[in-house]
């Protein structure tokens, strides 16, 4: 006999990275017929929704109107059908950004390189932080962590055309509080035509994702973001 229901899916709209004082919605998708959803924050019950009619609703939204460092952290959700509870969802790391200062991102030997060249990004921030994050825009992107007193280096090694794209970095004051994003650096990797056609640039977020971070909640893009978010969030942990 089944003791628990399948875990729900949790995500943030428009994004798990939220500029301070902006809004974010945490979505929890369970099953039709769920009579109660619970959102937990850092292990404690945060909010409850009992949708009506439950048989017509399989997703609830928990709205945070004003993001701040107190609201940043790990969220999970569960749902109940009758008296049977689900497994908890995966953890959602909600990050507050635009805290304090803006780092500077640079690339060596430069933003235009030839395939096979060694490339290193440098992220610098003079305020009190020792962890840095380098992000490449795009759904299948990776987040890299780096450490240093005021600067971290991110060696990419010999690059291919797959490394082409737009990069930004953040200083991290803790796992869930990040600086403003750096100005973008667009890396252009030239190679032979055959290689280039085999390695198209990653599909990117809409143009307004960076800087405004999709400030509207009506994007409908979160399922597309899920892969990117999953990668980024694994690195947070």
């Amino acid at each position: 006999q089944q003791q628990t229901l399948p875990k729900p899916f949790i995500w943030a709209e428009p994004h798990f990275m939220v500029p301070k004082e902006k809004q974010v919605t945490i979505c929890c998708q369970g099953n039709y017929g769920a009579v109660e959803y619970q959102l937990h924050f850092e292990g404690s019950l945060f909010a409850v929704d009992r949708p009506k009619p439950p048989e017509r609703i399989n997703k609830v939204q928990f709205y945070i109107p004003d993001m701040n460092s107190r609201m940043a952290g790990q969220y999970s959700c569960i749902y109940r059908v009758g008296e049977l509870w689900s497994e908890p969802s995966n953890l959602l790391d909600l990050v507050v950004t635009e805290m304090y200062d803006t780092p500077t991102l640079s690339v060596h030997p430069g933003p235009e390189v030839i395939s096979g060249e060694k490339v290193t990004f440098y992220c610098r921030l003079d305020t009190a932080t020792s962890m840095f994050l380098l992000l490449k825009e795009g759904r299948s992107s990776h987040v890299q962590r780096g450490y240093g007193k005021v600067q971290a280096e991110f060696p990419l090694g010999p690059v291919t055309t797959a490394h082409r794209g737009t990069y930004r970095c953040f200083g991290s004051y803790n796992n869930h509080a990040w600086s403003f994003p750096s100005e973008p650096v667009k890396l252009l990797v030239t190679g032979d035509i055959e290689n280039t056609s085999l390695a198209p640039e990653d599909p990117t977020f809409p143009a307004d994702t960076w800087g405004t971070y999709l400030l509207t909640t009506e994007t409908g893009l979160q399922k597309d973001h899920a892969l990117w978010d999953h990668t980024a969030q694994n690195l947070l942990r």
Epitope: T25, F41, S44, L45, F46, A47, V48, D49, R50, P51, K52, V60, Q61, F62, Y63, P65, D66, R70, M71
Partner: nanobody
Framework: QVQLVESGGGLVQAGDSLRVSCAAS????????MGWFRQAPGKEREFVAA????????YYADSVKGRFTISRDNAKNTVYLQMNSLKPEDTAVYYC????????????????????WGQGTQVTVSS
Amino acid sequence: QVQLVESGGGLVQAGDSLRVSCAASGRTFSTYAMGWFRQAPGKEREFVAASSRDGTTTYYADSVKGRFTISRDNAKNTVYLQMNSLKPEDTAVYYCAASRPLSTTQVGIASAWYEYWGQGTQVTVSS
């Protein structure tokens, strides 16, 4: 923006009942979920009870379940906390809080979920 004013606190004997009220300003009261919290001297503010925008979802702290009842009158812009079988450990300042969720059936349990707070009303239960 909503302003919240609590009233009805006082000094009662253990076992007595008391009803505290929270009046909200403005004409959009029905768009707010409401909660009651309390804070005893030297302790952290703790959740007591909450009511969703439409009143269909209510949620209680285990310590008050079966003794306290939260209700709301959207026509009067007021939320109530009926407290029965009061105990000395219920002594605290009682605060009402409001927030505007997307869902009519949602309530907040954590104080951080709420956007607006009243000044509080003192409830003292003597033994």
